[in-house]
């Protein structure tokens, strides 16, 4: 079952996926597309690396973080409820069947009518590592918490974790790392 | 016009071993996945082994992955399968085909005229 | 292993006539499925991807319809040319998997 990420109508929509290059600027070709991942690749490819660069992007989807570093999160502009559904990061490791690959499920609310002001709750001492997303405009203004690194084995347990967490709602937008090498 | 030319089947015997080539043209070879697709004598087919447009990614069936080893040569836009410990399991017509993936995975949009490989006991 | 249960094996028909085939994934498959055509001697020849998207050059008579795990070939007006024995596959997961196919002969 694919972990939740929920955003409003208008905003910009933040999913999370993560690497750790095995040295810096080594990186790992990622996929990003509309859909569950099929048997290899992406389906409906929104945006995609390569060992050097973004090199293939589609309007309103972009990474705002540091891929260079591992950081392949997608963000999506000004969503609108059609951008509702499975979204597939593949992080296209090489090797023999080495690929990751998760599914991201994005449920998109209509704008509230009165927008009131929401107090954010301070998780950093359990989190102290916390990453916070550049500004593109008012839309996108909460906070994201950065999961610790973890190893592959698991990874498959993060989700069911999360969401069983007293905490699954304030920490739905963070991302578990892989580390390569 | 694409292109898919398989050779090197033929007759082999049990536990034997064999190297496919697949040659390509009328595309970009490094621009697209490929795969070898085989049809047993009862005229089933099974994906058989499927690489990415640079060769880094690999990924097998099962029953072949310690015995069959996919690669290419993007230089010589050529495709190959080697075959080892051969079985009777393996009798087929193999078949490389093309597989688009960068805007939209698409399993084998053109397929080779295949090549016969025989096990015998 | 995801099977692709496909039926009929056979299907007669003659010319002009609508014929469906079905195949059913033992697993959810998406939209993640396409459907080739054979004909004898010959290599398979794509015809539908993403369950319901016609290859370039495929004629309309043919449609593709279905997600989740129920799938159908639909060839309307069925021509002389059409047959062929026509397989489905999955690519949702691995390892890729086709249906054992489905004779199209005439009457």
């Known amino acids: 079952s694919e972990v939740e990420y929920r955003a409003e109508v208008g905003q910009n929509a933040y999913l999370p996926c993560f690497y750790t290059p095995a040295a810096p600027g080594n990186l790992v070709p990622v996929c990003w597309g509309k859909g569950a991942c099929p048997v290899f690749e992406c389906g409906n490819v929104v945006l995609r690396t390569d060992e050097r660069d973004v090199n293939y992007w589609t309007s309103r989807y972009w990474l705002n973080g540091d891929f260079r570093k591992g950081d392949v999160s997608l963000t999506i502009e000004n969503v609108t409820l059609a951008d509702s559904g499975i979204y597939c990061c593949r992080i296209q490791i090489p090797g023999i069947m080495n690929d990751e690959k998760f599914n991201l499920k994005l449920v998109i609310k209509p704008a509230k009518v009165t927008p009131a002001p929401t107090r954010q709750r301070d998780f950093t001492a359990a989190f102290p590592r916390m990453l916070t997303t550049r500004g593109h405009g008012p839309a996108e203004t909460q906070t994201l918490g950065s999961l610790p690194d973890i190893n592959l084995t698991q990874i498959s347990t993060l989700a069911n974790e999360l969401r069983d967490s007293r905490l699954a709602n304030d920490l739905r937008d963070s991302g578990a790392t892989i580390r390569i090498g | 016009e694409v292109m898919l030319m398989e050779s090197g089947g033929g007759l082999v015997k049990l536990g034997g071993s064999l190297k496919l080539s697949c040659a390509a043209s009328?595309?970009?070879?490094?621009?697209?996945?490929m795969s070898w697709v085989r049809q047993t004598p009862e005229k089933r087919l099974e994906w058989v082994a499927t690489i990415s447009n640079s060769g880094g990614s690999i990924y097998y069936l099962d029953s072949v992955k310690d015995r069959f080893t996919i690669s290419r040569d993007n230089a010589k836009n050529t495709l190959y399968l080697q075959m080892s410990s051969l079985n009777s399991e393996d009798t087929a017509v193999y078949y490389c085909?093309?597989?688009?993936?960068?805007?939209?995975?698409?399993?084998?949009?053109?397929w080779g005229q295949g090549t016969s490989v025989t096990v015998s006991s | 292993s995801i099977v692709m249960t496909q039926t009929p094996k056979f299907m007669s028909t003659s010319v002009g006539d609508r014929v469906s085939v079905t195949c059913k994934a033992s697993?959810?498959?998406?939209?993640?499925v396409a459907w080739y055509q054979q004909k004898p001697g010959q290599s398979p020849k794509p015809l539908i991807y993403?369950?319901?998207t016609r290859h370039t050059g495929v004629p309309a008579r043919f449609t593709g319809s279905g997600s989740g795990t129920d799938f159908t070939l639909t060839i309307s007006n069925v021509q002389s040319e059409d047959l062929a024995e026509y397989f489905c596959?999955?690519?949702?997961?691995?390892?890729?998997?086709f249906g054992a196919g489905t004779k199209l002969e005439l009457k």
């Open positions: 993403s369950a319901s």
């Open positions: 009328g595309f970009t070879f490094s621009s697209y996945y």
């Open positions: 697993q959810y498959v998406d939209t993640y």
């Open positions: 596959a999955q690519y949702s997961s691995s390892p890729l998997t």
């Open positions: 085909a093309r597989d688009p993936y960068y805007s939209n995975y698409v399993p084998m949009d053109y």
